[in-house]
């Protein structure tokens, strides 16, 4: 099976992973900040 030129990128999936990891990290940090805020408000 032959690939038409330029639909082929053998490394794009790696960037997608990095972006997903960064997004997950951002969400985790946001959740942590929200918990801290709730603790402060709770006090």
């Amino acid at each position: 099976s032959e690939e038409p030129p330029i639909s082929l990128d053998l490394t794009f999936h790696l960037l997608r992973e990095v972006l997903e990891m960064a997004r997950a990290e951002q969400l985790a940090q946001q959740a942590h900040s929200n918990r801290k805020l709730m603790e402060i408000i709770g006090k």
């Epitope: 030129p5 330029i6 053998l10 490394t11 790696l14 960037l15 990095v18």
Partner: antibody, heavy 113, light 112 residues
Amino acid sequence: EVQLQQSGPELVKPGVSMKISCKASGYSFTDSTMNWVKQSHGKNLEWIGLIHPDNGGTIYNQKFKGKATLTVHKSSSTAYMELLSLTSEDSAVYYCANGFAYWGQGTLVTVSA
Amino acid sequence: DVVMTQTPLSLPVSLGDQASISCRSSQSLLHSNGNTYLHWYLQKPGQSPELLIYKVSNRFSGVPDRFSGSGSGTDFTLKISRVEAEDLGVYFCSQSTHVPLTFGAGTKLELK
């Protein structure tokens, strides 16, 4: 037809930095990743890292962090790799490779006093 | 880093012979997205590497059908059914499943 035209051979002194260019044509530059590979001693291949021209996102081989910096200039469809504080260990042929599929002709870098 | 081990390092052949090159990875190359990012390149003397086979068994555009790739997980093979003069050079396997991307040491296909 996809073409990657790299800058010419360089003879540089130890301690200096230099930039290699890779001009892309024949496809939409911002649609796919650009990889950079080092080949020393005519055989050994090492992946340096990649950049996505659309958003500037990069991934580096830990070994080359602090040694190589990848950038792009979208309007001229050109990718660049800057090599920092060169030593004799950096003497090699450097390739750009679009999507890890199409390769440039290589740029020979010789570091010598 | 994923270590790619190619055998043999040198492969003397006669034109018309079948040639087979093995590549083993130190960990599975099956990505979580279902793809296996194992590729084969040929570097002819004085030239850049050129992609032959991508994702284990797909021939890149313009690659003759005498080239075939197979394997899964950690064990892969490139076969050339009838070697022609233009096939001589150094063959590299490479993986782009894991960062950093890594290459085998190369197999030199040469005439006996």
